[in-house]
């Protein structure tokens, strides 16, 4: 029975040229994570393997970087990386949970005046 | 599933070298990465090297840094460890691993590598 809860930084802005950090915490349950996936629609960006560590797709090399914990830090933001990102945490007994944030970047004047979901 | 073979190893003397390989067959085309991790008697497991298939880039445990290497064959999904400078130390059962974007992982046999003094 799947007991465990992902928690999400949910809807999400930021600039563009800016980074951002996308997390997610797995909470309300004893499995043992055995992987961490992040995908935005089809695309693998990178996996956190718990024996083999940190990988990231070729493609996303220069502009993704492992951290902080299990979350993934994007960089250098255009707007087409706007759209829907998938935490996907294997576990075992449990088997798979996913969170999802949606991250809207914004050219630079846009975010300096109040965007929708800012963080302060 | 993934099938995982490690071979080379064996014993020897401080100082010398072993090349270990991992033969991956099966469902291998969502394989990300692969590695090695290495078990001593009475100890845990831990992770010794790893390379992304993607794009060959590797990490190492910083107590094999300058003295192992990783590589992969893609062509015969085949990844080794050049083990150089080998120590006492080092002696372990080594054990290949795979990750794959389904998550499900895969582990091999081991292979015992043994160092003398």
């Known amino acids: 029975m799947m007991t465990g809860t992902i928690e999400t930084t949910g809807n999400i802005s930021a600039e563009k040229g800016g980074s951002i950090i996308l997390q997610c915490h797995l909470s309300s349950t004893t499995a043992q994570v055995t992987q961490v996936n992040w995908e935005q629609q089809d695309q693998l960006l990178a996996i956190c393997n718990a024996d083999l560590g940190w990988h990231i797709s070729p493609s996303f090399k220069d502009r993704v970087a492992p951290g902080p914990g299990l979350g993934l830090t994007l960089q250098s933001l255009t707007v087409n990386d706007t759209g829907e990102y998938f935490c996907i945490y294997h576990t075992y007994p449990d088997g798979t949970y996913t969170g999802r944030i949606f991250l809207e970047v914004l050219e630079s004047s846009v975010a300096e005046h109040g965007a929708r979901f800012q963080i302060p | 599933e993934v099938q995982l073979v490690e071979s080379g190893g064996g014993l020897v003397q401080a100082g010398g070298s072993l090349r270990l390989s991992c033969a991956a067959s099966?469902?291998?085309?969502?394989?990300?990465?692969m590695g090695w991790l290495r078990q001593a008697p009475g100890k845990e497991r831990e992770f010794v090297s790893a390379?992304?298939?993607?794009?060959?880039?590797?990490n190492y445990a910083d107590s094999v840094k300058g003295r192992f290497t990783i590589s992969a064959d893609n062509a015969k999904n085949t990844v080794y460890l050049q083990m150089n400078s080998l120590k006492p130390e080092d002696t372990a059962v080594y054990y290949c691993?795979?990750?794959?974007?389904?998550?499900?992982?895969?582990w091999g046999q081991g292979t015992q590598v043994t160092v003398t003094s």
């Open positions: 099966g469902r291998t085309f969502d394989t990300y990465a």
């Open positions: 691993a795979a990750a794959r974007r389904s998550g499900r992982g895969s």
């Open positions: 390379i992304s298939t993607g794009d060959g880039s590797t």
